[in-house]
C-alpha cells in the first residue's frame, strides 16, 4: 500500500435545503484507471461510511441509487455533493481515495471537512 496526499476544504456550510458540496483532490504520481472514493463521517469518535463510489477515469461517479451522495470528477478532483442533511448530521466528513487499478494500490485519506448543518426555521403561519 502506498500513501497519497488528499486535500479537502476544512469547513463547508450546508445550504438551507440541507445540501453540502466540496472538492476532494488527490495527488497521484500517475493516472489511475479505476478509483474508489469513500466519504466517512466522524462524530463523537465514531466513524461511519456515508457513501462510496468506484469509477473509471473519465467516466461519471456512480453511487448507489439510494445514496445521499452524488459526484463528478475532473482529473484528480472529485466534486462531491451530500444531500438531505439535517442539523444532527453536522460533523467531520472525511474523503478517502483508493487507486484500485493499475497496481500498486494507493491509499489517501483527507483531514476531513467539517460540515455545519443548520435546520431552517419553520415558516410562521400567515393569515391572508
Amino acid at each position: 500500500c502506498k500513501a497519497m496526499h488528499v486535500a479537502q476544504p476544512a469547513v463547508v456550510l450546508a445550504s438551507s435545503r440541507g445540501i453540502a458540496s466540496f472538492v476532494c483532490e488527490y495527488a497521484s504520481p500517475g493516472k489511475a484507471t479505476e478509483v474508489r472514493v469513500t466519504v466517512l463521517r466522524q462524530a463523537d469518535s465514531q466513524v461511519t461510511e456515508v457513501c462510496a463510489a468506484t469509477y473509471m477515469m473519465g467516466n461519471e461517479l456512480t453511487f448507489l441509487d439510494d445514496s445521499i451522495c452524488t459526484g463528478t470528477s475532473s482529473g484528480n478532483q472529485v466534486n462531491l455533493t451530500i444531500q438531505g442533511l439535517r442539523a444532527m448530521d453536522t460533523g467531520l466528513y472525511i474523503c478517502k481515495v483508493e487507486l484500485m487499478y493499475p497496481p500498486p494500490y494507493y491509499l489517501g485519506i483527507g483531514n476531513g471537512t467539517q460540515i455545519y448543518v443548520i435546520d431552517p426555521e419553520p415558516c410562521p403561519d400567515s393569515d391572508f
Epitope: A27, S28, P29, G30, K31, A32, T33, S74, G75, N76, L99, P102, P103, P104, Y106
Partner: antibody, heavy 119, light 107 residues
Framework: DVQLQESGPGLVKPSQSLSLTCSVT?????????WNWIRQFPGNKLEWMGH???????NYNPSLINRISITRDTSKNQFFLKLSSVTTEDTATYFC????????????WGQGTSVTVSS | DIQMTQSPSSLSASLGGKVTITCKAS??????IGWYQHKPGKGPRLLIY???TLQPGIPSRFSGSGSGRDYSLSIRNLEPEDIATYYC?????????FGSGTKLEIK
Amino acid sequence: DVQLQESGPGLVKPSQSLSLTCSVTGYSITSGFYWNWIRQFPGNKLEWMGHISHDGRNNYNPSLINRISITRDTSKNQFFLKLSSVTTEDTATYFCARHYGSSGAMDYWGQGTSVTVSS
Amino acid sequence: DIQMTQSPSSLSASLGGKVTITCKASQDIKKYIGWYQHKPGKGPRLLIYYTSTLQPGIPSRFSGSGSGRDYSLSIRNLEPEDIATYYCQQYDNLPLTFGSGTKLEIK
C-alpha cells in the same frame, strides 16, 4: 531499494537494430508500474519512447511506432528496447525508468547508456 | 502531442537566492506535471509530481505551483548542489512530453 540499470552496445551501424536491456532490482516488474524507455539527444532534448505495463501491454510514441518494440523477460526481471533501421539521428543516451499509472511521472531512473550510431 | 514550452533555457543565481522556472503546456494538463533535476552521468531525479507534491526525500526548498496550462518550479535558499538542468514533464496524455530544460548555474 529499487534500481534500474541499462546495458547494451555503445556503437551501432546505420540501418541495423539497436537493442538495450533494463535490469530491475528491488521490485518485480509484474507487480505494478509501467516500465519506460526515454532517450536524451546530444542537445539535451528528452524524448519518451514507450513503455510496457506490469501485465505486458505496450504504448509507443507515435513518432517511433514503425521501428520500436518493448518486450520483457519476467523470469529475469528485465525489459528490453529494440529500435530498428537506426540512423545517426538515433545517437543518444538511453534511459529506462518507471512510472505509476497509464501515464505518470518517473520516480526511478537508470543512469543511462550512451549509444552512437555510426558506420 | 502536448508541447511543453520551458523558460528560461538557462539562468544564473546567487547562493541563498531564489529562482523560478516556468513551463507552459499547449493545452490544459489538469495539474498532471512533474519536475526533474538532472546532473551529468546520472538519471533524472523526480522532485515534484502533480504540480506541487514533493517526492519523498526532496527538500522543502523546492516547490511547485500552477494550473491549466501554466506551471512553475521554484527553488529557494539555493545551494551548490542545485547546479543541474531542470525539466518539466506532462503526464496528462500519451505520448509523455518534456520541456526543453533549464540549465541552472550559480554566480
